[in-house]
């Protein structure tokens, strides 16, 4: 024998205690699939959520962050707070990276700079809070006589044909 | 930490009302389902109802006697209760919930219950 509730589209329960007919979900519920004996209540995107999609008979809400601050979490679970690049979020706020550290997003934590000379390099530009060194040639590279940089060609006078 | 505490409970005559009541602590109901349970001594746990966002859904049993309502400045919701019987004799549980009704959920909090008596 079918259960009756199988004939029960999204957007509605099966009433158990009337005769098993569909019902529809009440407002901010939702079903998302056919057959169920009950509705799931609609999340609700409030205080530092904002609701990106609104909640439908067949589908939940979805949520994400205000201004400033940025999701977390599977399905937006949580909202953290924004800080500027060049900081991390702390117990007590954002603060600076430390010497030697750096963020370049407004989220997450800071981060050592690149250790240039651990793979044989020198560094080209020094790292900031924002940003990371850059890395360059290996210092053997840049001794006189070393160079593997094919040096530009001379630059030819208008008017004269090659030799 | 939720916490539901019901109230209203008491001896009552035959043919009489209670209203009872289920207050809300570490938490507003505005995201739950609100449902009434009862257990008569020595018997299996029955679903009175379900109140969520302006509806409620009730057990078969109860032949529109019982009314819930909510009162979301109070963030407390009532079970009204008319035309008593001997046999609405029961302690009768608030538990809240992320599914309507609550007819075959378990719910994600339950209050410690309240007793109502109905003889004469």
């Known amino acids: 024998l079918q259960d009756p509730c199988s004939n029960c589209p999204a957007g509605t329960f099966c009433d158990n205690n009337r005769n098993q007919i569909c019902s529809p979900c009440p407002p901010n519920s939702f079903s998302s699939a056919g057959g169920q004996r009950t509705c799931d209540i609609c999340r609700q995107c409030k205080g530092v959520f904002r609701t990106r999609k609104e909640c439908s008979s067949t589908s939940n809400a979805e949520c994400d962050c205000t201004p400033g601050f940025h999701c977390l979490g599977a399905g937006c679970s949580m909202c953290e707070q924004d800080c500027k690049q060049g900081q991390e979020l702390t117990k007590k706020g954002c603060k600076d990276c430390c010497f030697g550290t750096f963020n370049d997003q407004k989220r997450g934590i800071c981060r050592p700079w690149t250790n240039c000379s651990l793979d044989g390099k020198s560094v080209l530009v020094n790292g900031t809070k924002e940003r990371d060194v850059v890395c360059g040639p290996s210092p053997a590279d840049l001794s006189p006589g070393a160079s593997s940089v094919t040096p530009p060609a001379p630059a030819r006078e208008p008017g004269h044909s090659p030799q | 930490e939720v916490q539901l505490l019901e109230s209203g409970g008491g001896l009552v005559q035959p043919g009489g009302s209670l209203r009872l009541s289920c207050a809300a602590s570490g938490r507003t109901f505005d995201n739950y389902a609100v449902g009434w349970f009862r257990q008569a001594p020595g018997k299996e746990r029955e679903y009175v109802g379900t109140y969520w966002s302006g509806y409620a859904h009730y057990g078969d049993f109860e032949n529109n006697r019982f009314t819930i309502s909510r009162d979301n400045s109070k963030n407390t919701v009532y079970l009204q209760m008319n035309s008593l019987r001997a046999e609405d004799t029961a302690v009768y549980y608030c538990?809240?919930?992320?599914?309507?009704?609550?007819?075959?959920?378990?719910?994600?909090?339950q209050g410690q219950g309240t007793l109502v008596t109905v003889s004469s």
């Open positions: 538990a809240i919930s992320l599914k309507y009704p609550m007819a075959t959920v378990t719910p994600d909090y």
